[in-house]
């Protein structure tokens, strides 16, 4: 009917188009309007035109569209119970939120080493700066020449942590660290795509209750069943892609203080004090070029000293003092924003229902009749395809029976076929644990349903 | 909290029988598996059978077929085992213990009833 | 029958340490293994239940993975009270089958 409607308003608009419009130069009105006001009625024809052509383009693309719309209709498979070719796939799904963070990366590489400066002249000696904070190892830079070796500086605070260097090449193996407390629990990531139904992994022992199923076949009241164990896990899903780093969680509050750690590699060295009032000057020797450093010399007699030096910029870091014991743990850093979801794993099979839920039974009478499995919230058959005793037995013991006899023609069930060439040997404890098709897939009817008749 | 009450030591014979009580209690008597099992001191353990109260359904190591008889009384929670024809390497700790399911863990024990066989 | 092979009769770890205790079956048994704790003169325990679930009021030090052939009980932070033998068990086939045991022992 809408098709209809369009085709009608479309051949009305162009009779409307073409006699209104293209041939308006026979009318009379026309023609009034041209010789009255000339440019008026151009401009005024020219753009009453632009409207028409633009709602007649309208008209068409929207008989075009229906007109696809019914070729959907008419020739949709389903229309006729035939099932329609795939459809392409659906677009890309937004990207999912930020990943937790990443783990630091490792130290970055040493600085290169400076060209070696000219001596300058000694200065008095500063008081010690204080300590600088313990340098990340670097690797072992050239041997430089011997220098007198220096006073001792008084031990520094700790410096400021330095930036975080860009990624080094690895260190030697350090000493094992102690164990951390472990992490508290990260949230619940975003769930994935629903993935294609996995292979069936092995069913678990009972899961805790599920959320409350549709309403089932009325069974005799019987008292309410501990909780049960939660399924095992499903075959394990593909990797999800990395989520990108999220930002770093807040400083946990400071451990206790920890014992010595080992010594790390010296810092280097801080910037030379300002110079002392310098003593009396000795007689200037012409310079030579500079050689390689002498063996020191004999001490000199000490002039008189000078008036004591402003105070030195901070000295080299001292020695790392010997490894500290492991703090207490801070406390949990804000969580990092979400990582995008990854793709979906493959699907494992469900678990267990909790409680005193069964996931078999017999239709028919308490112990013989047609055997069905509950699987995917939907009770569904066995079919027949090398079903046998041995079969029998492990589904009988599932319902607390000890023999079992498998039965044939007992009756066409309806829905799922779940299982099919079911093949126990007959001492498993669960038909899960039996070499079996995936679920769902057979190539049966139910005219081949399964059963069972158990007895203790 | 289930609980599972086993009846005192046995002195016994070699070649006579026993039968060992388990009371239960806290947990659907009839909706689960009681096992029995054997502990020699300073071994391992030895799973003996399950019967399903539900059922009285029964599954046996075949080990232990023939020797160990498994029942239960519903009205009192209460499952036993009459182990027969009795030798001393049957000398050793026997414990009931329970499971939902027949592929579920034994999540409640009894303390165990001490049975030595010497003449 | 499944065997079920606990390779280590005693381990040794000091209070705080971090002890794994690994169980093997002779065929695939899926994840379908409990692991129990026996301390002297009790009944045993649940700790672990379908090889890696932590049964309900178990410390979180105490942990299982593996499926298939290869199970591992791991207790971090190991306390004087973990002093006991340690059992795996499989209940996929019957008869249900159990290892010899590991005994811990704290220094």
């Known amino acids: 009917v809408q098709v209809l409607n369009l085709q009608a308003r479309l051949r009305v608009l162009e009779m409307y188009f073409l006699n209104d419009t293209l041939a308006a130069e026979d009318s009379p009105s026309f023609s009034l309007l041209q010789s009255a006001h000339p440019g008026e009625h151009l401009a005024q024809g020219a753009s009453r035109l632009q409207v028409l052509q633009a709602q007649l383009t309208w008209v068409r693309v929207s008989h075009e569209h229906l007109l696809q719309r019914v070729d959907n209709f008419t020739q949709n498979p389903g229309m006729f119970r035939i099932k329609g070719e795939q459809g392409a796939p659906g677009l890309q799904g937004h990207k999912g939120a930020m990943g937790m963070p990443g783990a630091p990366g490792p130290p970055g590489p040493p600085a290169e080493k400076g060209a070696k400066g000219a001596m300058g002249r000694d200065g008095a000696t500063g008081p010690s700066g204080p300590q600088g904070p313990p340098g990340v190892k670097g690797e072992a830079g050239l041997q430089g020449p011997q220098g007198a070796p220096g006073k001792q500086g008084a031990t520094g605070t700790p410096g400021p942590q330095g930036e975080k260097g860009s990624k080094g090449d690895g260190g030697l193996i350090g000493p094992k660290g102690e164990t951390g407390t472990k992490g508290e629990k990260g949230d619940l990531g975003l769930p994935g795509s629903k993935g294609d139904r996995g292979m069936k992994g092995d069913a678990g022992v009972m899961g805790p209750p599920g959320a409350q199923g549709s309403k089932g076949d009325f069974g005799r009241p019987g008292p309410p069943g501990l909780a049960g164990f939660p399924g095992a896990k499903g075959d394990q899903g593909q990797p999800g892609l990395q989520g990108v780093p999220g930002p770093p969680g807040a400083v946990g509050h400071p451990g206790a203080k920890g014992e010595p750690g080992s010594a790390g590699s010296p810092g280097r060295a801080g910037l030379p004090g300002s110079p002392g009032s310098p003593g009396a000057t000795g007689l200037k020797g012409s310079k030579g070029d500079t050689g390689l450093q002498g063996q020191q010399g004999r001490k000199g007699e000490s002039g008189v000293p000078g008036p004591a030096g402003v105070k030195g910029e901070q000295g080299s870091p001292g020695l790392a003092g010997p490894k500290g014991a492991p703090g207490q743990a801070g406390q949990k850093g804000d969580q990092g924003v979400k990582g995008s979801s990854g793709e979906q794993g493959v699907k494992g099979e469900k678990g267990e229902r909790g409680e005193n839920s069964v996931s078999v039974r017999i239709v028919g009478s308490s112990n013989r009749g047609r055997a069905e499995v509950y699987y995917s919230g939907t009770w569904g058959t066995i079919c027949d395809d090398e079903w046998q005793n041995s079969d029998a037995i492990v589904f009988c013991r599932m319902l607390g029976y000890s023999k079992g006899r498998a039965l044939y023609k007992v009756g066409a069930g309806t829905g799922q076929i779940w299982l099919d060439n079911v093949q126990c040997r007959g001492t498993e404890s669960t038909l899960w644990s039996c070499t079996k098709n995936s679920w769902g897939h057979h190539d049966c009817s139910h005219e081949e349903d399964a059963g069972v008749e158990c007895s203790v | 909290q289930g609980q599972m009450q086993q009846s005192g030591a046995e002195l016994v014979k070699p070649g006579a029988s026993v039968k060992l009580s388990c009371k239960t209690s806290?947990?659907?008597?009839?909706?689960?598996?009681i096992s029995w099992l054997k502990q020699k001191p300073g071994q391992s353990l030895e799973w003996i059978a399950w019967?399903?109260?539900?059922?009285?359904?029964?599954t046996y190591n075949q080990k232990f077929r023939g020797r160990a008889q498994l029942t239960v009384d519903t009205s009192s929670s209460t499952a036993y085992m009459q182990f027969s024809s009795l030798t001393t390497d049957d000398s050793a700790i026997y414990y009931c213990?329970?499971?939902?399911?027949?592929?579920?863990?034994?999540?409640?024990w009894g303390q165990g009833t001490s049975v030595t066989v010497s003449s | 029958d499944i065997v079920m092979t606990q390779s280590q009769k005693f381990m040794s770890a000091s209070v705080g340490d971090r002890v794994s205790v690994t169980c093997r079956a002779s065929q695939n048994v899926v994840t379908n293994v409990g692991w129990y704790q026996q301390k002297p003169g009790q009944s045993p325990k649940v700790l672990i239940y379908?090889?890696?679930f932590r049964y309900s009021g178990v410390p979180d030090r105490f942990t299982g993975s593996g499926s298939g052939t290869d199970f591992t009980l791991t207790i971090t932070n190991v306390q004087s009270e973990d002093l006991a033998e340690y059992f795996c068990q499989q209940y996929n086939n019957y008869p249900y089958t159990f290892g010899g045991g590991t005994k811990l022992e704290i220094k």
């Open positions: 379908s090889a890696s």
């Open positions: 806290g947990f659907t008597f009839s909706s689960n598996y």
């Open positions: 019967i399903y109260a539900g059922t009285g359904g029964i």
């Open positions: 213990a329970r499971h939902v399911r027949g592929y579920h863990p034994m999540d409640y």
